[in-house]
């Protein structure tokens, strides 16, 4: 006999970095039939919706209308069908941002490499905070953090042209309070013979930093889902 | 701006019954999930009762389930809270709070958590005697 449902999938709109004071969705999809949806917030319940009639919806949403530190953490969901309780969604980093400074990014050697070079990427925040993160532009950018006093370094080793784009880094001040965006570092890589076209991206995934640089010019962009960044198992 | 007052509160004893009321003014008060939560002589604030702004959804804590109801009235911007069967440990002081920012809240969801609201009373205190 069945013990649980299958878990529901949990993500943010319009993305899981919300700059401060800016509004964020956080949506829950689990099955139709379900009575009620809970949000789970550092492991407390946060919220509660018994969607109606809940036999025609299977999503939910959380809007949150105001982004601050205490909101930042990590949420999950669960879902309930009849007395039969799912397994709890994978966990959603709610990150703010726009928080005290902004830091300074550069690269050596430089902008412009030869494919095969070896790049490194700094990230440089004279205030207190002892992590950085650098993200690429992209629908499949992923977030690599770096660690040091007022700097952290980001080796890519020998580069290719999949390194080609715009990258951005931030300090943390926590793991979900970072620091305003630095400004754009284009990398432009050349000399592949094999490859000189940009590498394709991953289509099944929205553009990313185009999402969050929505949210900081515009506020709330509706009905652009967004998956969460830690992958759905 | 907003402003919550609360009142209703009282000295009973206990298995007597008690009605807290919420007037909200500054706001969209149809438009927005209320809470009420509470914080005995000692202890730390804590959720007591939820409901959504269309009244479907409510929510309680094990605590007071089967004793407590909220409610509200959307026309006279006011939300309730009727206690029945009060307790010794009934004893506290009461807020209502409301939650921030605008329109686009479910009609079906509630907040269970004090970080979720922006705006609260100055709270009503409840004491019950035996």
């Known amino acids: 006999q069945q013990q649980t449902l299958p878990k529901p999938f949990i993500w943010a709109e319009p993305h899981f970095m919300v700059p401060k004071e800016k509004q964020v969705t956080i949506c829950c999809q689990g099955n139709y039939g379900a009575v009620e949806y809970q949000l789970h917030f550092e492991g407390s319940l946060f919220a509660v919706d018994r969607p109606k009639p809940p036999e025609r919806i299977n999503k939910v949403k959380f809007y949150i209308p105001d982004m601050n530190s205490r909101m930042a953490g990590q949420y999950s969901c669960i879902y309930r069908v009849g007395e039969l309780w799912s397994e709890p969604s994978n966990l959603l980093d709610l990150v703010v941002t726009e928080m005290y400074d902004t830091p300074t990014l550069s690269v050596h050697p430089g902008p412009e490499v030869i494919s095969g070079e070896k790049v490194t990427f700094y990230c440089r925040l004279d205030t207190a905070t002892s992590m950085f993160l650098l993200l690429k532009e992209g629908r499949s950018s992923h977030v690599q953090r770096g660690y040091g006093k007022v700097q952290a370094e980001f080796p890519l080793g020998p580069v290719t042209t999949a390194h080609r784009g715009t990258y951005r880094c931030f300090g943390s001040y926590n793991n979900h309070a970072w620091s305003f965006p630095s400004e754009p570092v284009k990398l432009l890589v050349t000399g592949d013979i094999e490859n000189t076209s940009l590498a394709p991206e991953d289509p099944t995934f929205p553009d990313t930093w185009g999402t969050y640089l929505l949210t900081t010019e515009t506020g709330l962009q509706k009905d652009h889902a967004l998956w969460d960044h830690t992958a759905q198992n | 701006d907003v402003q919550l007052v609360e009142s209703g509160g009282g000295l009973v004893q206990a298995g007597d019954s008690l009605r807290l009321s919420c007037a909200v003014s500054?706001?969209?008060?149809?438009?927005?999930?209320m809470g009420w939560f509470r914080q005995g002589p000692g202890k730390d604030r804590e959720f007591v009762a939820a409901i959504s702004w269309s009244s479907s959804t409510t929510y309680y804590a094990d605590s007071v389930k089967g004793r407590f109801f909220i409610s509200r009235d959307n026309a006279k911007n006011t939300a309730y809270l009727q206690m029945n069967n009060l307790r010794l440990e009934d004893t506290a002081v009461y807020y209502c709070?409301?939650?921030?920012?605008?329109?686009?809240?479910?009609?079906?969801?509630?907040?269970?958590?004090?970080?979720?609201?922006?705006?609260w009373g100055q709270g009503t205190l409840v004491t019950v005697s035996s």
């Open positions: 500054g706001r969209t008060f149809s438009r927005l999930p």
């Open positions: 709070a409301a939650v921030g920012g605008s329109l686009d809240y479910s009609a079906t969801v509630v907040y269970t958590a004090a970080r979720a609201y922006a705006d």
